[in-house]
């Protein structure tokens, strides 16, 4: 039950996170005009990954796309790439995790297969979240650098008496959405990985081996322990056979998730 809850919660958290990453990537307010300590302008400038916008005091908003690819800063291209990779990985992760959910039965899918899929989706969510956090952080770092550079040159002389005011940009809403969404996706991924450990059967599936013990014959059946929700001792588990014969298989240590292919 706890495994199903953990897996389900991980899926939901990741779903919200990936939706947030998509929203952040599409948002126009990655950087917004800094209004503090600036001349009061009758326009408000803000920029996204794909276009820049200007809202005039009348409420009229005009946006222009970045129609060039080669002319854009390498950092912006890198941020775009990170966000897209994050979305793609997250989307694939969501697809995989749907089939991995314990509450959904698909044919005669083994628990081990579900465990593998849960682990795979969990790793994808973690990488997706990290991509989003990295992308947003790179953009934020770019903003901070440019902010202080433009503060240093706040008023640059133009032909003696004429001055030009440099527009400074600060963090936009999309950055906070991206950080939170990336964090949620990361947490969701970790939860999926934790759920994977509980989903994994407690023993490797060896072929049934028949052997004879002195006195009477016993067939050793695989799955001597029923799958438990975690690792470590489980006093509730009962052996499903009784016999004096023992094999090396019986006394082996509990399998780890790496035992499953």
């Amino acid at each position: 039950m706890a495994v199903t809850a953990c897996q389900g919660l991980g899926f939901v958290v990741s779903l919200i996170g990936i939706a947030g990453i998509i929203a952040a990537t599409c948002m126009d307010q990655w950087s917004t005009q800094d209004l503090y300590n600036n001349p009061v302008t009758a326009v408000f400038n803000y920029q996204g990954l794909w276009r820049s916008c200007v809202r005039e005091s009348s409420g009229f908003t005009e946006c222009r796309g970045y129609f060039t690819l080669l002319g854009l800063p390498a950092m912006l291209q890198a941020v775009r790439a990170l966000m897209i990779v994050g979305i793609v990985l997250g989307a694939i992760g969501l697809l995989v995790s749907i089939f991995a959910l314990k509450c959904i039965r698909i044919g005669s899918m083994e628990d081990s297969a579900k465990a593998n899929m849960t682990l795979t989706s969990g790793i994808m969510f973690i990488v997706s979240g990290l991509c989003a956090i990295a992308g947003v952080s790179v953009f934020a770092n770019m903003l901070v650098t440019n902010f202080w550079m433009s503060t240093a040159n706040m008023y640059t002389g133009m032909g003696g008496m004429v001055q030009t005011v440099q527009t400074r940009y600060t963090f936009g809403a999309a950055l906070f959405v991206g950080w939170v969404a990336g964090g949620l996706t990361l947490i969701g991924g970790v939860m999926m990985c934790i759920a994977c450990r509980g989903l994994a059967p407690e023993e490797t599936n060896y072929k049934a081996v028949s052997y004879h013990a002195s006195g009477h014959s016993v067939a050793y059946k695989p799955g001597g322990f029923k799958a438990s929700t975690g690792f470590g001792s489980n006093t509730k588990n009962k052996k499903i056979y009784d016999g004096g014969a023992r094999t090396e298989d019986e006394v082996q240590s509990y399998p780890s998730k790496h035992d499953y292919v």
């Epitope: 005009q33 001349p39 009758a42 400038n45 200007v54 009348s58 009229f60 004429v162 030009t164 005011v165």
Partner: antibody, heavy 120, light 113 residues
Amino acid sequence: EVQLVESGGGLVQPGGSLRLSCAASGFTFSSFGMHWVRQAPGKGLEWVSYISSGSSPIYYVDKLKGRFTISRDNAKNSLYLQMNSLRAEDTAVYYCARAGYAVRNALDYWGQGTLVTVSS
Amino acid sequence: DIVMTQSPDSLAVSLGERATINCKSSQSLLNVGNQKNYLAWYQQKPGQPPKLLIYGASTRESGVPDRFIGSGSGTDFTLTISSLQAEDVAVYFCQNDLFYPLTFGGGTKVEIK
């Protein structure tokens, strides 16, 4: 047809108060920012104040802050300018003007103006 | 505050001739966000309110004759009346539309020679 009609001007003594009104018609008043601009006799234009469609933000020319108050009533399609502690230099024709949409913040329609004379 | 300086103060031009009015701002009126200039030109005839002619430094307001041409960028702007007509006798004002307080130039009086 867009129409802006100012009223409330007249002769007032220095230190007195006056409230100007601007009645708007022919457009959706609640969707537009509005300005007050004044022009002293024989002089140039001087921007006074701006109020956005939702009454915030509001801007004033620095020298009139504290004495003049701009407000609007979207239900009545009206713009107001409350002028207190009036001085002789406030004598001018006061125009209300609409902040045009998609015209780079320009003032696209103006009223005929109302004359305010501050004199003892 | 942005200071708008218009020149000349007055201008006498023959009918059909070109009239040129200059306007200089103390700070650039080019908004980097959209690469647009926030400068407007107004025409005021005696006893009338101002009328918007040009916005965004070069875009004519609807209904304005094409003999009125706005040009310039940054801090230097020009209003040109390519062929002066009798009805163009008026005072012309430029206005900063980028920074509050919005400021006007002192005006240029255009007359017929």
